[in-house]
């Protein structure tokens, strides 16, 4: 019996087609992805093949103005239109709190939403009861397939799930649910979830009875053969893990941003064992036409977005200096504003020991592309912020050793004076450079804001200590020459859309007046 699994993950509100790098589509003939194009390909496969499941491994939420405006209603609407069979909850599904998950998505989805390792307690237990499930049994042709969901246990550090959801260890939570499916005579089981490729592989290895793992969170691109675009494969598709009980378990993921549709064919024997598995992600490029009815629906929903981008978010009473003459040479108040917004967006998970889990921000000056003039009545709009941060990136959470941070700050000024983009703007950091010294030895003082303290203060950076830092995904991926970050990071979790982070902060503050205050000397 053959099953076709179509899968997406980390779509991050790319409802419209995008450019090859998943930013705003400029030249339509070279654009990719989007739900209208995805629908064309999905329908084509559904017509051609008998047993097809369309699955999503989480993080539909967050990433473009679509999410900012529609707050998840767009996800439910278009996933319903595409007729997804199931979805696993990702960490970003909690970005607007539990209410922001229940109202627009859980109440509106016409498909099951899954997570076995999220347990509700207190008043939330009854409120959310039945709206998401640990598993679902789906009939496919003449057979049944069990789908069990999981979500990153780091979600409380990455999003806003509140205090009434407990995120258990994935493997511990999955095993009893898989066992339950076995007692229901379900012998074909897919683990669908959002914890990253390393955890996906562990689930394949450790959870008895799981036949296939469909993952997300780490934006992993797997491919067999010559890759069709810029993404470099992290391994073959599917990636085969040998389980502890000796089975060959295929693990898949489909990069991110709706650029690819994962396509996996699995052959099962009559006892539900995987005999063979093969496939590849399908690049959703312009050779696949956009479905006209979905496209028309997208255009209808788009109207509200255009109105939103010119509305006032808040006011500035000072000039927001985002000029390259400032931000690539010295501390600039636009850099301070953005870093403050980045930290504010990550205020969560305080306890008796820690006032917050992260206090530091770094931001490449070259990523700041425009100033905002306060003389336009002080008004700040989404459109203004899109000029400052035009690349459609995210502000991510990484864990780095102090020694890596030191290298990053040396890199920041290794060729100072040439108006290059690697000069770092900061938050929660005080850095002093001596530019008379030779490159690679210019950082003379590097103090960082403590987190394990009741009164935050600046302490010297410790080389062997592990620090959490918020930074643009561009830097986490080694951009602007920050190879040491990419090579040495100990953990990387993708965060919220850059413009959204700053716009939320400005809306919260209402009036802003960031200063140059001696963070960089």
């Amino acid at each position: 019996w053959e099953l076709t699994i179509l899968h997406t993950n980390d779509v991050h509100s790319r409802l419209e087609q995008t450019s090859e790098d998943s930013s705003k589509c400029v030249n339509a003939s070279r654009c990719m992805g989007g739900v209208a194009r995805l629908f064309t390909k999905v329908q084509q496969i559904r017509r051609a093949e008998p047993n097809v499941l369309l699955l999503d491994a989480g993080d539909q939420y967050q990433g473009t103005i679509w999410f900012t405006v529609y707050k998840g209603a767009e996800v439910a609407h278009f996933m319903n239109a595409l007729r997804y069979d199931a979805m696993a909850l990702g960490n970003h599904e909690f970005d607007n709190g539990v209410e922001g998950l229940i109202e627009p998505l859980l109440k509106e989805a016409k498909f099951p939403i899954l997570s076995a390792n999220i347990k509700a307690k207190g008043p939330l237990a009854s409120q959310i009861s039945g709206l998401y499930l640990p598993y679902k049994v789906l009939p496919v042709g003449d057979e049944v397939v069990g789908i069990v969901g999981y979500t990153s246990k780091e979600t409380p550090f990455l999003s806003n799930p509140g205090t009434n959801l407990v995120f258990e260890d994935e493997i511990t939570a999955l095993q009893p649910e898989v066992d339950k499916l076995k007692t229901l005579n379900v012998n074909k089981i897919i683990a669908l979830g959002h914890s990253g490729f390393e955890t996906d592989k562990l689930i394949a290895q450790k959870v008895r009875g799981v036949d296939v793992v469909v993952g997300g969170h780490s934006n992993t691109f797997l491919y067999t053969g010559n890759p069709p675009s810029k993404e470099v494969p992290a391994g073959k598709y599917p990636f085969i893990v040998t389980s502890d009980d000796g089975r060959k378990v295929p693990v898949v993921q489909a990069y991110a941003f709706g650029k690819y549709l994962g396509y996996l064919k699995i052959e099962f024997d009559e006892r539900g064992n995987v005999i063979s598995s093969h496939g590849n992600p399908i690049l959703l490029n312009s050779s696949i036409p956009e479905d006209p009815s979905i496209k028309a629906d997208i255009n209808k929903w788009r109207i509200k977005l255009d109105n939103y981008s010119t509305q006032e978010l808040g006011k500035t009473i000072v000039y927001l200096d985002g000029s390259s003459q400032s931000c690539r040479f010295r501390e600039c108040n636009m850099g301070n504003l953005i870093c403050d917004a980045m930290i504010n967006n990550n205020l969560r998970h305080a306890d008796e020991m820690f006032w917050n889990h992260v206090s530091m921000c770094i931001l490449n000056g070259g990523g700041i592309r425009s100033p905002i003039d306060e003389r336009n009545n002080g008004t700040i709009t989404w459109e203004n912020l899109a000029a400052v941060l035009p690349f459609g990136g995210t502000f991510d959470l990484v864990q780095l050793k102090g020694s890596t941070l030191k290298k990053a700050f040396e890199h920041s000024v290794h060729r100072y004076g040439q108006s290059t983009g690697e000069f770092l703007q900061v938050g929660g950091i005080h850095v002093v450079y001596d530019l008379s010294r030779k490159p690679g030895d210019r950082v003379v003082k590097l103090d960082v804001l403590c987190t394990k303290c009741r009164v935050p203060s600046y302490d010297p950076l410790k080389m062997d200590e592990i620090y959490k830092v918020i930074l643009p995904n561009f830097l986490a991926n080694g951009g602007d020459g920050f190879q040491m970050i990419k090579d040495e990071l100990l953990r990387h979790d993708s965060g919220d859309q850059d413009i959204n982070v700053v716009s939320t902060y400005i809306s919260k503050m209402k009036v802003i007046y960031p200063a140059v205050e001696g963070r960089i000397k």
């Epitope: 007729r83 498909f111 409120q127 009861s129």
Partner: antibody, heavy 117, light 106 residues
Framework: QVQLVQSGAEVKKPGASVKVSCKAS????????MHWVRQAPGQGLEWIGE????????NYNEKFKSRVTLTRDTSTSTAYMELSSLRSEDTAVYYC??????????WGQGTLVTVSS | DIQMTQSPSSLSASVGDRVTITCKAS??????LSWFQQKPGKSPKLLIY???IWVDGVPSRFSGSGSGQDYTFTISSLQPEDIATYYC????????FGQGTKVEIK
């Protein structure tokens, strides 16, 4: 367990209004939409409309839009359906039903509304 | 508005017979179709949604299939307790019920 308990039978004159209630228990009332459906004697089922109890948003069947009002009281976990300008063809059993995955899972026991002069 | 045409309007079959009811939508409804059972004097009961997904506790003799505009509900082996009227419901765009099929035992 989920229960939807509706108000008792009503007899109304043509031109009058009727308000039927549906009290939910066994789940959080505001977490699921509530549908209203009617069934004339010996006839099939006809969808009237639905309400999202948490925010009060409604969707109506075009046929009833001008005469029906769906409301809710979250403090008592009760949904209401009011139908005005009653005529004899409105004689029917009126049901509330909870929405899940877009469809209707749990139904109330029904309320017979008789319109007669 | 989406119209649903359900057939037959009634049928009579023997215990153990295979019974099939069809529903045709006036346009593609994306498999967003449910089947309900209503016994005399009772409220409808959801059996199947999304064209083919059973509700927990529903006997396996009930099944649904179909896609696009055409859907089928099957009782593989009719039992005395299956005497009822069966309705389809589309929920792709708002909601429309089929006219119903009354199932009787010969």
């Amino acid at each position: 367990q989920v229960q939807l308990v509706q108000s008792g039978a009503e007899v109304k004159k043509p031109g009058a209004s009727v308000k039927v209630s549906c009290k939910a228990s066994g789940y959080t009332f505001t977490s699921y939409w509530m549908h209203w459906v009617r069934q004339a004697p010996g006839q099939g089922l006809e969808w009237i409309g639905e309400i999202n109890p948490s925010i009060g948003r409604t969707n109506y069947n075009e046929k009833f839009k001008s005469r029906v009002t769906l409301t809710r009281d979250t403090s008592t976990s009760t949904a209401y359906m009011e139908l005005s300008s009653l005529r004899s063809e409105d004689t029917a059993v009126y049901y509330c039903a909870r929405r899940v995955y877009g469809t209707m899972d749990y139904w109330g026991q029904g309320t017979l509304v008789t319109v007669s002069s | 508005d989406i119209q649903m045409t359900q057939s037959p309007s009634s049928l009579s079959a023997s215990v153990g017979d295979r019974v099939t009811i069809t529903c045709k939508a006036s346009q593609d409804i994306n498999s967003y179709l449910s089947w309900f059972q209503q016994k005399p004097g009772k409220s409808p009961k959801l059996l199947i949604y999304r064209a083919n997904i059973w509700v927990d506790g529903v006997p396996s003799r009930f099944s649904g299939s179909g896609s696009g505009q055409d859907y089928t509900f099957t009782i593989s082996s009719l039992q005395p307790e299956d005497i009822a009227t069966y309705y389809c419901l589309q929920y792709d765009e708002l909601y429309t019920f089929g006219q119903g099929t009354k199932v009787e035992i010969k």
